[in-house]
């Protein structure tokens, strides 16, 4: 059977048929259905939704749809003993308490099982002490406090504003600074866009709104009790003291009305500069402690949440490939939400549902993809990417041999301005070519391509006439596939025009106000942006699963490797004397990148010329493309982060959401001037250059002619 025969009709016609079948009205209907009640991981409601999705995917025509369950560590507030923070006077009397829950949005007042705001996996505790305001609690904020301002956070309760970096990194930084508790709050400067009303009259965060979220530092481990292995029926579980990534101090989130009451009394040092001031009418004094009249008052946290091993359920659907059933293209997104999940995740889940329906329609008409497509509805993403990671741990041997690509499908929108794509360089050309074929949904770009509106609104900083495509970081379910297993991965969604606020999320992120109405009234009334995201995600899956030659261009990897090598060399050259003293050379890395570039170029030439009707040669060339991402995996992992194994990319050690290039070298160089043993520190830099150079060279050789 030739590869075209199996698909019945020509690939271009297939793609058009698939895209034409996607309907905005269906996405809208699915979003409504998925958002009427909360679907918190580990709850009966989320189990019922899993079974509903299983049933509907079967109806849509998938070959099989199974539930995959795991028993993982989750965290919940105590229903009878609520979490809150107090201001206490010298007698220990509580003179102010933070809110116990968010005011429910209109129409949802009688909904039960809305989990109150909490920081998942916070330990229990009732610390009391003076407050220190630590800005965003980034690494550089603590450097400013400790090194420049000589403020000691040891034994203090710190209050940090949400935004800029993943909340787990904030907590880790506070712990390292010696804090005994952390209060996280949403400042209007980061979560209230000027000129927009707060919900329910607009998409801004009201003063009573609070961002939930986990505060783990898992570094890719998955379930904290079973790192590296699936949390199945016969799993050996670590004791809680040995669990991976749990915070050691109590943490609690609040809204800006409550934050105002805590911050307005702050005394001590003035903020070091304007970047430490938010938008509240408070002085943003750093502390420690309250000002004169209130100096005897303290802050007390009351945290009673519990960690519990709980069953979670992934839904895994299979559409078997006609020609290469042992090659898997995966589309996955999570199903669990903090509350209603109007954006996160159900705007993504609704899109996946419609993509499955469209593929199912084609299959019912006799079509099959060339390669197998796996669809996944992940559970417990909000608790640390647990569902996807456990499934990948259980199926790692299959995935590392058969995994072609993973496309992530969390929130379809975080704004309605333009497209945002993060992916492996292997997918750059796929994304460019696909978006040139899709219509832009943007006002003022009628009749123009998505590529054109995207490039105009979000231009590449390096290449004129091309759109920005970002590095993959983490904080979502692609992590295990890309950072641990080395499967080419990508994600796409519609975003806001707010580059400076890249990692803060949209104002109502993880609050009770993330409802269907938020999307339908304010973000995407016509669901045209959702449809566009469905076309991008679905189109990528279609091409990856159906093109005869995999749509990966290894030359784009060569380009970025050179860019990343230049960047890390520039960072190192800030220390010219030490580089000379310790004989630090990047020659091996630049040589490896040069070799990679030449070999990739020759491979691409061969890819144009080879006989595509020879199934053995075709499979051989495709395998070289598929395994290229895998070749960047170091089986030993990064220092102290064994599950981050990709040598070219890892989540930043200072912000899980952000991607870092040549992370091993970057971390070895970070703050190197403060290291007590410079010889040892520069020795580690040299070792990391060696690892990177070797890996790039080894990856290049996988593209060489096989014999």
């Amino acid at each position: 059977k030739s590869s075209n025969e199996a698909t019945n009709i020509t690939p271009k016609h297939n793609m058009k048929a698939f895209l034409d079948e996607l309907k905005a009205e269906n996405i809208k209907k699915f979003l409504y259905n998925f958002t009427q009640i909360p679907h918190l991981a580990g709850t009966e409601q989320n189990f019922q939704l899993a079974k509903q999705i299983q049933s509907q995917w079967k109806e849509f025509g998938l070959d099989s749809v199974e539930l995959a369950h795991y028993d993982v560590l989750l965290s919940y507030p105590n229903k009878t003993h609520p979490n809150y923070i107090s201001i206490i006077n010298e007698d220990g009397n509580e003179i102010f308490n933070t809110s116990l829950f968010e005011p429910p949005p209109p129409g949802y007042e009688n909904v039960s099982d809305i989990v109150p705001p909490f920081s998942a996996f916070s330990p229990q505790g009732m610390p009391e002490g003076d407050l220190v305001y630590v800005n965003y609690a980034r690494t550089e904020d603590f450097f400013k406090l400790e090194r420049d301002m000589k403020i000691n956070c040891s034994g203090k309760i710190v209050i940090a504003r949400y935004g800029k970096v993943f909340r787990g990194n904030k907590v880790k930084n506070a712990q390292l600074a010696g804090a005994k508790g952390v209060i996280l709050y949403s400042d209007p400067a980061d979560y209230f866009a000027p000129g927009v009303k707060s919900y329910p009259d607009g998409w801004n965060l009201p003063g009573g709104g609070v961002q939930r979220g986990n505060i783990l530092n898992l570094n890719g481990a998955g379930d904290p009790l079973t790192p590296g292995y699936p949390a199945n029926e016969y799993a050996y579980r670590r004791g809680i003291a040995e669990a991976v990534g749990l915070p050691s101090i109590p943490v609690h989130p609040i809204g800006y009305y409550d934050a105002q009451k805590l911050l307005e009394k702050m005394g001590g040092s003035a903020p070091p500069d304007s970047s430490w001031r938010g938008s509240l009418k408070v002085p943003y004094n750093v502390g420690p402690g309250f000002t004169g009249n209130f100096s005897t008052q303290k802050v007390k946290m009351h945290i009673h949440s519990t960690n519990e091993v709980t069953r979670i359920y992934n839904v895994i659907g299979t559409l078997r490939g006609a020609v290469e059933p042992d090659r898997y293209v995966i589309l996955g997104g999570h199903r669990d939400s903090w509350v209603f999940g109007g954006i996160d995740p159900q705007s993504g889940a609704a899109v996946v549902h419609e993509i499955v329906r469209s593929f199912g329609t084609l299959k019912k008409e006799g079509w099959r993809p060339r390669r197998t497509i796996l669809f996944a509805s992940w559970d417990a993403e909000e608790f640390g990417l647990l569902g996807s990671t456990e499934w990948a741990e259980e199926n790692s041997r299959l995935l590392q041999e058969r995994g072609v690509a993973y496309i992530n499908a969390d929130s379809s929108i975080e704004g309605n301005y333009t497209l945002r794509v993060d992916c492996t360089p292997l997918m750059y050309s796929l994304v460019h070519n696909l978006t040139k074929e899709l219509k832009s949904p943007d006002e003022g770009f009628e009749g123009k391509s998505l590529y054109e509106s995207w490039t105009k609104k979000s231009p590449s900083p390096e290449f004129s006439g091309m759109p920005r495509i970002s590095k993959l970081g983490s904080g979502n379910d692609f992590e295990v596939f890309f950072q641990r297993l080395g499967i080419a991965s990508g994600r796409a969604r519609y975003t806001k025009n707010w580059e400076t606020n890249k990692f803060s999320g949209y104002p109502l992120y993880h609050s009770v106000y993330e409802t269907y109405e938020l999307v339908e009234k304010f973000y995407d009334p016509m669901f045209k942006y959702h449809l566009t995201v469905a076309q991008v995600r679905g189109g990528m899956v279609f091409e990856l699963a159906n093109s005869i030659v995999l749509p990966f261009d290894c030359r784009d990897y060569a380009v970025v490797l050179r860019k990343y090598a230049d960047k890390i060399y520039s960072i190192s050259m800030k220390h010219p004397q030490e580089m000379k003293t310790y004989s630090v050379s990047f020659d091996s890395l630049f040589s490896a990148v040069k070799n990679f570039t030449e070999i990739a170029s020759k491979f691409s030439e061969r890819l144009q010329d080879f006989d595509k009707s020879n199934p053995i040669v075709l499979r051989m060339m495709n395998d070289q493309l598929m395994f290229l991402e895998r070749a960047f995996i170091d089986p030993l992992g990064l220092p102290d982060r064994p599950f981050y194994r990709h040598v070219i990319y890892a989540p930043s050690s200072h912000n899980k959401y952000a991607g870092e290039s040549f992370p091993g070298i970057y971390d070895a160089l970070f703050d190197i001037e403060s290291k007590v043993d410079p010889s040892k520190a520069w020795g580690e830099v040299k070792r990391q250059i060696y690892v990177a150079a070797f890996t790039v060279q080894a990856a290049a050789e996988t593209l060489s002619e096989v014999a």
Epitope: Y84, F96, N97, T98, S99, L100, F101, E102, P103, P104, P106, E109, P206, G207, G208, G209, G255, Y257, D258, Q260, K261
Partner: nanobody, 123 residues
Framework: QVQLVESGGGVVQPGRSLRLSCAAS????????MHWVRQAPGKGLEWVAF????????YYADSVKGRFTISRDNSKNTLYLQMNSLRAEDTAVYYC????????????????WGQGTMVTVSS
Amino acid sequence: QVQLVESGGGVVQPGRSLRLSCAASGFPLISYGMHWVRQAPGKGLEWVAFQTYDASNRYYADSVKGRFTISRDNSKNTLYLQMNSLRAEDTAVYYCARDRIVGGRVPDAFDIWGQGTMVTVSS
């Protein structure tokens, strides 16, 4: 439409107790801080008590602190004022009022009032 209806007033002897109720309709009590305010005969308005929407904080005028307790039953959409150790100077028309700020943490301005219920403390 949005309204507040107070009840439970009456004549009571000094030192005795009374419980006022305020039934809210047309809006969910669960989202709003609520106040009790009173007006003694021939006097101006006096703020009495405030409770946040989630009942996490209660604030009282000094004149009633330790004697009056503000509470609510969000499921019944009803606010209460338990008045103990009543005194002659507590004689007034008692109004419940909605705080204008959804989710407010401290007393602010009122945007909706009831028609009031009369409490007379007399031997």
